[in-house]
């Protein structure tokens, strides 16, 4: 399960962007049916999502991020405006609504600091490639949701269940695009920052930065030690594979049902094959 | 804002307000009155579609909120009005979103129009 | 029910002044602060506790989440002279605290 995330072919919005359609489970409901009222809320923001898309296509490079603000933001004030239920109850309708509210909160907020700074061309790609990549992780989490009673959900996931992984991937992606927008001597702050702000994000701030899950920060620490010693100008890129790599181990581990444990050795393991390839590449700097 | 003025008690007044540069059919629009010397009070919302509308305890049954989606404009309809209704009267949009985050706030208002009830 | 204090504070140009807002119970981070200047309509310098809002000079800033809030003019200018609101958008209705009055010595 490749990340599929390549720095060095920029997306293309307008025509590749295909932000998530929260169908439910089919024995929750008939596909594409939204049962609960927050799957209906995230419903209607990916419709205005998509919208926008378009509008934003129909116009020079320069007034994207205008026309796509400006679209999107009228379709997402009505979502929140007509639902849930239509009535005004202000951020915290239901506990499910607050923690929706939150969640699309800190999306919106990750995607405008992913594009702070940037030229009007890439500001849009900035901030539509991170709030794609968040809107689909939110529809994926209220996926899950529909499954279940609001009563028997896990509310925190503990620190170092595997569930959490999979989002882990999506968050990943969310860094690596607002990193690779960034000036060389920003990547990995911009990286670090975004990584945290996704994970938030998608977890409902369960978790408050990657260093809350021992997989994970074990996985980012070698990343770190990757790159020690290696020429500057590639430094974040080392970085940045190693991580993906670990990252995709830990998925395998996910999908094979494995204990955290072992999930963190494979996730090592990756880690270090990583590394290798990684210094070989770069003139065989290693540690 | 307009339709501000002297009343005597247990007359009617309606006040209008007109939007203009942005999408009014996609905003709450909510009136709010302050008193001479006083703090703010909201007084009615209405939905974006008319299907909601919500009125504080001192007007229910004396007050009516509509609105005209096709010319931007929000009425309020006010009845049987009372020395205590006197005030500086405001429209303003309610904003739940921009580009940044989630808003919660009421982020436009009008220049509010005075009504004065006395007799 | 919101509870600004204090009422009202007196300062002097490029004094640091905080104003506080209580909320009678949690109302994670949905807050705003409005400027209101006499015989004009509010306007609205914070919203979500500590976003500024567009336009609004950087002076001002706003935090805290659940009870507790505060808006600060970090260096009050001669146009910060005015009655300051909090305003809540946890739940409907959505309420106002009863201002605080900025002036300048």
């Known amino acids: 399960a490749d990340l599929g995330y390549g720095p060095a072919t920029p997306a293309a919005p307008a025509a590749g962007y295909t932000p998530a359609t929260p169908a439910a489970p089919a024995e929750a409901a008939p596909a594409g049916k939204a049962t609960t009222e927050e799957q209906k809320l995230i419903e209607k923001i990916n419709a205005g999502f998509k919208a926008a898309l378009a509008a934003a296509a129909g116009v020079q490079p320069a007034d994207k991020y205008r026309t796509f603000v400006a679209t999107f933001g009228a379709a997402s004030n009505k979502a929140f405006a007509e639902g849930l239920s239509g009535e005004p109850k202000g951020a915290a309708e239901s506990s499910s609504k607050a923690a929706l509210t939150s969640k699309l909160d800190a999306a919106y907020k990750l995607a405008y600091k992913t594009a702070e700074g940037a030229t009007p061309e890439a500001k849009y790609d900035a901030y539509v490639a991170t709030l794609s990549e968040a809107l689909r992780i939110i529809a994926g989490t209220l996926e899950v949701h529909a499954v279940k009673p609001a009563a028997e959900e896990v509310k925190v996931i503990p620190a170092g269940e595997l569930q959490v992984i999979e989002k882990v991937d999506a968050a990943f992606k969310v860094a690596a695009t607002a990193a690779n927008a960034a000036p060389a001597n920003d990547k990995f702050t911009v990286f670090e920052a975004a990584f945290n702000d996704a994970i938030k994000a998608s977890t409902g701030g369960a978790y408050e930065s990657y260093k809350f899950i021992p997989a994970l920060e074990a996985a980012v620490k070698q990343a770190y030690a990757a790159t020690v010693a290696t020429a500057p100008e590639v430094k974040y890129t080392v970085f940045e594979t190693a991580l993906k790599k670990a990252i995709t181990a830990m998925s395998e581990a996910q999908k094979a049902a494995k204990p955290a444990a072992a999930a963190t050795a494979t996730a090592t393991a990756a880690v270090g094959a990583a590394t290798g390839a990684a210094t070989a590449a770069t003139g065989g700097y290693k540690v | 804002e307009s339709g501000g003025g002297v009343v005597q008690p247990g007359r009617s007044l309606r006040l209008s307000c007109a939007a203009s540069?942005?999408?009014?059919?996609?905003?709450?629009i909510y009136w709010v009155r302050q008193a001479p010397g006083k703090g703010l009070e909201w007084v009615a919302m209405?939905?974006?579609?008319?299907?909601?509308?919500h009125y504080a305890d001192s007007v229910k049954g004396r007050f009516t909120i509509f609105r005209d989606n096709s010319n931007k404009t929000v009425h309020l309809q006010m009845n049987n009005l009372r020395s205590e209704d006197s005030g500086v009267y405001y429209c303003?949009?309610?904003?739940?979103?921009?580009?940044?985050?989630?808003?919660?706030?009421?982020?436009?208002w009008g220049q509010g129009t005075m009504v004065t009830v006395s007799s | 029910e919101l509870t600004q204090s204090p009422s009202s504070v007196s300062a002097s140009v490029g004094d640091r002044v905080t104003i506080t807002c209580r909320a009678s119970?949690?109302?994670?981070?949905?807050l705003a602060w409005y400027q209101q200047k006499p015989g004009k309509a509010p306007k609205l310098l914070i919203y979500?506790?500590?976003s500024l809002q567009s336009g609004v000079p950087s002076r001002f800033s706003g935090s805290g989440s659940g009870t507790d809030f505060s808006l600060t003019i970090s260096s009050l200018q001669p146009e910060d002279s005015a009655t300051y609101y909090c305003?809540?958008?946890?739940?409907?209705?959505?309420?106002f605290g009863q201002g605080t009055k900025v002036e300048i010595k």
């Open positions: 979500s506790a500590s």
């Open positions: 540069e942005f999408a009014f059919d996609s905003y709450e």
């Open positions: 209405i939905s974006i579609d008319e299907t909601n509308k």
């Open positions: 119970q949690g109302i994670s981070s949905w």
């Open positions: 303003a949009r309610w904003n739940n979103w921009n580009h940044r985050g989630m808003v919660f706030a009421f982020d436009l």
């Open positions: 305003q809540q958008a946890n739940s409907f209705p959505y309420t």
